[in-house]
């Protein structure tokens, strides 16, 4: 005959454990029911009565099957640099993540404890590693033949436009300015940028070599977080 199903509370067989969604109550020395997520144990079990569960109050939660006497408090409201990506309910805690343009400088078990603004690369410097949810932007100087004239946490250095006749040579913080004859872009079409303050880095203030002698310059790879460098700026 099949073994009879035991109903909680019941005394476990020696050496055996309680079943799924049950716990062993040391005082009653019985296997008793756990409370479902969103509830907590209002009255613990005895040898003759099972656990009495009650719903979590507002702003409290339990995420797992449990026998805790009180529900856990939801975390405080998200700060102004955060967005609430998961609301506080009886079954889950509030989760705050950093809003766009910020990254998590100090994480916690779920969500973020401290957000910080993504570093902005100043003119003459470009993004060499895009920011992520958990890492800051890295800025590096624009290589010869490239420029960035923005203060931005997303802009990479871009190649100077190629002019038939150069009016003003480009530098690290300014695109080349062509005379009225139409330029050939070395990049996707875009507006001609007006002169900006010249970078203090002498290596980038020299006229760019003609294409025939320019070094084969290429890729764009990003890197890990770094402390604020001279190429970065605060908000």
């Amino acid at each position: 005959l099949p073994a009879q199903v035991a109903f909680t509370p019941y005394a476990p067989e020696p050496g055996s454990t309680c079943r799924l969604r049950e716990y062993y109550d040391q005082t009653a020395q019985m296997c008793c029911s756990k409370c479902s997520p969103g509830q907590h144990a209002k009255v613990f079990c005895t040898k003759t009565s099972d656990t009495v569960c009650d719903s979590c109050e507002d702003s409290t939660y339990t995420q797992l099957w449990n026998w805790v006497p009180e529900c856990l408090s939801c975390g405080s409201r998200c700060s102004s640099d955060q967005v609430e990506t998961q609301a506080c309910t009886r079954e889950q805690n509030r989760i705050c993540t950093c809003r766009p343009g910020w990254y998590c400088a100090l994480s916690k078990q779920e969500g973020c404890r401290l957000c910080a603004p993504l570093r902005k690369c100043r003119p003459g410097f470009g993004v060499a590693r895009p920011g992520t949810e958990t890492s800051d932007v890295v800025c590096k100087p624009c290589a010869p033949g490239t420029f960035s004239n923005t203060t931005s946490s997303t802009d990479i250095c871009r190649p100077h436009q190629i002019c038939n006749v150069v009016a003003i040579p480009g530098n690290a913080s300014m695109d080349a300015v062509c005379t009225s004859t139409s330029p050939t872009r070395s990049m996707a079409p875009g507006a001609v940028h007006l002169p900006q303050p010249v970078s203090t880095r002498s290596q980038h203030t020299q006229p760019t070599p003609e294409p025939s002698t320019a070094p084969s310059t290429s890729f764009l790879l990003p890197m890990g977080p770094s402390p604020p460098a001279e190429g970065s700026t605060g908000d």
């Epitope: 890729f219 764009l220 990003p222």
Partner: antibody
Framework: EVQLVQSGAEVKKPGATVKISCKVS????????IHWVQQAPGKGLEWMGR????????EYAPNFQDRVTITADTSTDTAYMELSSLRSEDTAVYYC???????????WGQGTTVTVSS | QAVVTQEPSLTVSPGGTVTLTCRSS?????????ANWVQQKPGQAFRGLIG???DRAPGVPARFSGSLLGGKAALTLSGAQPEDEAEYYC?????????FGGGTKLTVL
């Protein structure tokens, strides 16, 4: 003139470790990342990782992260790539480079041949 | 890690147009992958041609152009020259690392 000069060829036994150097000149080493790329015989390129010489921060390809260590010494303008637990599939030419999909500062070392054989 | 796939080989006639593509195993290629294209000629140094999906590197001839086509990165060579015969590699950025494709051997014939 920008130059990246790598150390010479190496022959190693399986399980050993190899450390290759890459001496840069002609630019400020902290201005650009240094990358390491593998090219096995008859095969394509495999990006291994990179170092920011300014602060030593590194990023590695998932396929290599357990075995590779990339460092940079700004006092000697030299970057290093150490690959451990060598196996025969690691027989390849290894290149250091300033190629960085974000900067157009594109220079490559001459390559270092590593042969792993018992 | 992600796998980046390219055509193993392509052939183009001198003066003709050819498009090389670069597919990501993780989904459509976007501008956040900062697609790069690198050229390797036998016995010569590598040369970066395209960065940031569609920016030609300084000194790269206008016949090379980069774009996104149907969820893939693409390198189009318009008016192929004999000296363009080479191996072409694409590289895609994935949050904190680069992945190269297997390369396309381009023959100008």
């Amino acid at each position: 003139e920008v130059q990246l000069v790598q150390s010479g060829a190496e022959v190693k036994k399986p399980g050993a470790t190899v450390k290759i150097s890459c001496k840069v000149s002609g630019y400020t080493i902290t201005d650009f990342y240094i990358h390491w790329v593998q090219q096995a015989p008859g095969k394509g390129l495999e990006w291994m990782g990179r170092v920011d010489p300014e602060d030593g921060n590194t990023e590695y390809a998932p396929n290599f992260q357990d075995r590779v260590t990339i460092t940079a010494d700004t006092s000697t303008d030299t970057a290093y790539m150490e690959l451990s637990s060598l196996r025969s599939e690691d027989t390849a030419v290894y290149y250091c480079s300033t190629w960085d999909g974000f900067s157009y500062f594109d220079y490559w070392g001459q390559g270092t041949t590593v042969t792993v054989s018992s | 890690q992600a796998v980046v796939t390219q055509e193993p080989s392509l052939t183009v006639s001198p003066g003709g147009t050819v498009t090389l593509t670069c597919r990501s195993s993780t989904g459509p290629v976007t501008t956040n992958n900062y697609a790069n294209w690198v050229q390797q000629k036998p016995g010569q140094a590598f040369r970066g041609l395209i960065g940031g999906t569609n920016d030609r590197a300084p000194g790269v001839p206008a016949r090379f152009s980069g774009s996104l086509l149907g969820g893939k990165a693409a390198l189009t060579l318009s008016g192929a020259q004999p000296e363009d015969e080479a191996e072409y590699y694409c590289a895609l950025w994935y949050r904190n690392h680069w992945v190269f494709g297997g390369g396309t051997k381009l023959t100008v014939l």
